[in-house]
């Protein structure tokens, strides 16, 4: 699997999950979130050659098409597969509020 | 929706489904398929700016991150959303066999 275990410990050039830290205030303009100040969101990057973690029948076809037509702009793309939630704390007036934000952290990628 | 109805009738530069015809023999090397000779597979292409058909909470965050950090390599990617099957005919000896290949035709795209 193209997950953090594999990708973070390798120098994989093909589609893999990469490290990305997002600062809520600086990178998103979300100044009102109290905790955390930011988080390891990660992102997916790298080419999707034929047979590399292909998602559907279509992505297999497209990767094969790309192999036969190397100059074509039609190619599978490296995108998130498994996403995890992130708990945040913010204040409503003086009252702290905890919220679980779904689909915020990339754990693995796929070629789609 | 970034589907064939909208995308094929517009000059949309952002993420949209694009026309792509795949010839089984020439483009994939699949000589054994009797019918059809090829099909309109289509493909997804175009940038994914902030708010453009974003798939998950993560893709919203990443698009916003990209807006604040324009030079970053982390950005959502335009990939298939709705896929349709394709019926094919091939021969096993003299006997024709009809098969439905799932997820073969792109009908719409999303930013993931």
């Amino acid at each position: 699997a193209l997950d953090t275990n594999y990708c973070f410990s390798s120098t994989e050039k093909n589609c893999c999950v990469r490290q990305l830290y997002i600062d809520f205030r600086k990178d998103l303009g979300w100044k009102w979130i109290h905790e955390p100040k930011g988080y390891h969101a990660n992102f997916c990057l790298g080419p999707c050659p034929y047979i590399w973690s292909l998602d559907t029948q279509y992505s297999k076809v497209l990767a094969l098409y790309n192999q036969h037509n190397p100059g074509a702009s039609a190619a599978p793309c490296c995108v998130p597969q498994a996403l995890e939630p992130l708990p945040i704390v913010y204040y409503v007036g003086r009252k702290p509020k905890v919220e679980q934000l779904s689909n915020m952290i990339v754990r693995s990628c796929k070629c789609s | 929706a970034l589907d064939t109805n909208y995308c094929f009738s517009s000059t949309e530069k952002n993420c949209c489904v694009r026309q792509l015809y795949i010839d089984f023999r020439k483009d994939l090397g699949w000589k054994w398929i009797h019918e059809p000779k090829g099909y309109h597979a289509n493909f997804c292409l175009g940038p994914c700016p902030y708010i453009w058909s974003l798939d998950t909470q993560y893709s919203k965050v990443l698009a916003l991150y990209n807006q604040h950090n324009p030079g970053a390599s982390a950005a959502p990617c335009c990939v298939p959303q709705a896929l349709e099957p394709l019926p094919i005919v091939y021969y096993v000896g003299r006997k024709p066999k009809v098969e439905q290949l799932s997820n073969m035709i792109v009908r719409s795209c999303k930013c993931s």
């Epitope: 100044k31 009102w32 409503v92 009252k95 779904s102 | 902030y50 708010i51």
Partner: antibody
Framework: EVQLVQSGAEVKKPGASVKVSCKTS????????MNWVRQAPGAGLDWMGQ????????NYNEMFEGRVTLTADTSTSTAYMELSSLRAGDIAVYYC??????????????WGQGTLVTVSS | DIVMTQTPPSLSVSPRETASISCRAS??????????MHWYLQKPGQSPQLLIY???NLESGVSDRFSGSGSGTDFTLRISRVEANDTGVYYC?????????FGQGTK
């Protein structure tokens, strides 16, 4: 230029619901909280609640007894306020107003033009 | 809930004079070194507009004839060299405690 453009005036029967829209432009919709404030004829301002459009988090004023529902459509940068079980006391101008950005509850720096809701049998 | 009381309820001022409006909160609206008090003007037939943010910070684009002061429970909005265009209803607002609340207005 930041703009908040609200839907037109509504006339509703008692017990019915009303849904007011607030179409935004000129800023990043998912960066700011959107508040809703109402003003009865000749009266002051009452805060109804707020929504963070990025993931739909809401905070409501208990005064509205669960009758108000706030939603947002990020694809069109539009916020919505639905008020149910309408009564004569709900006759008011309803405003959407963007939060200043430093806190969830905050000052409001941009306001819509207001939507008059009339309740009449 | 924090109740905001404005005085006077209405005020008539001659051009070029100074006007003062008071706002008293039922409990302190100070937290983390800030006073969570803001001032708005609602001109006839218009939506409210933000004048002063966090007790004393002038909102961009607002005339420097407007100034705010105070802390804790007592706050004041001053308008120097009053103009006819300043006519309207002035509201204070706190956001230190949920629910956010406004004063009843000073005309």
């Amino acid at each position: 230029e930041v703009q908040l453009v609200q839907s037109g005036a509504e006339v509703k029967k008692p017990g019915a619901s009303v849904k007011v829209s607030c179409k935004t432009s000129g800023y990043t919709f998912i960066t700011y909280w959107m508040n809703w404030v109402r003003q009865a004829p000749g009266a002051g301002l009452d805060w109804m609640g707020q929504i963070f459009p990025a993931w739909g988090s809401t905070n409501y004023n208990e005064m509205f007894e669960g009758r108000v529902t706030l939603t947002a459509d990020t694809s069109t940068s539009t916020a919505y306020m639905e008020l149910s079980s309408l009564r004569a006391g709900d006759i008011a101008v309803y405003y959407c107003a963007r939060g200043y950005g430093n806190y969830a509850l905050d000052a409001m720096d941009y306001w819509g033009q207001g939507t008059l809701v009339t309740v009449s049998s | 809930d924090i109740v905001m009381t404005q005085t006077p309820p209405s005020l008539s001022v001659s051009p070029r004079e100074t006007a003062s409006i008071s706002c008293r909160a039922s409990e302190s609206v100070d937290s983390y070194g800030n006073s969570f008090m803001h001032w708005y003007l609602q001109k006839p037939g218009q939506s409210p507009q933000l004048l002063i943010y966090l007790a004393s910070n002038l909102e961009s684009g607002v005339s420097d004839r407007f100034s705010g002061s105070g802390s804790g429970t007592d706050f004041t909005l001053r308008i120097s060299r009053v103009e006819a265009n300043d006519t309207g209803v002035y509201y204070c607002q706190q956001n230190d405690e949920d629910p956010l609340s406004f004063g009843q207005g000073t005309k």
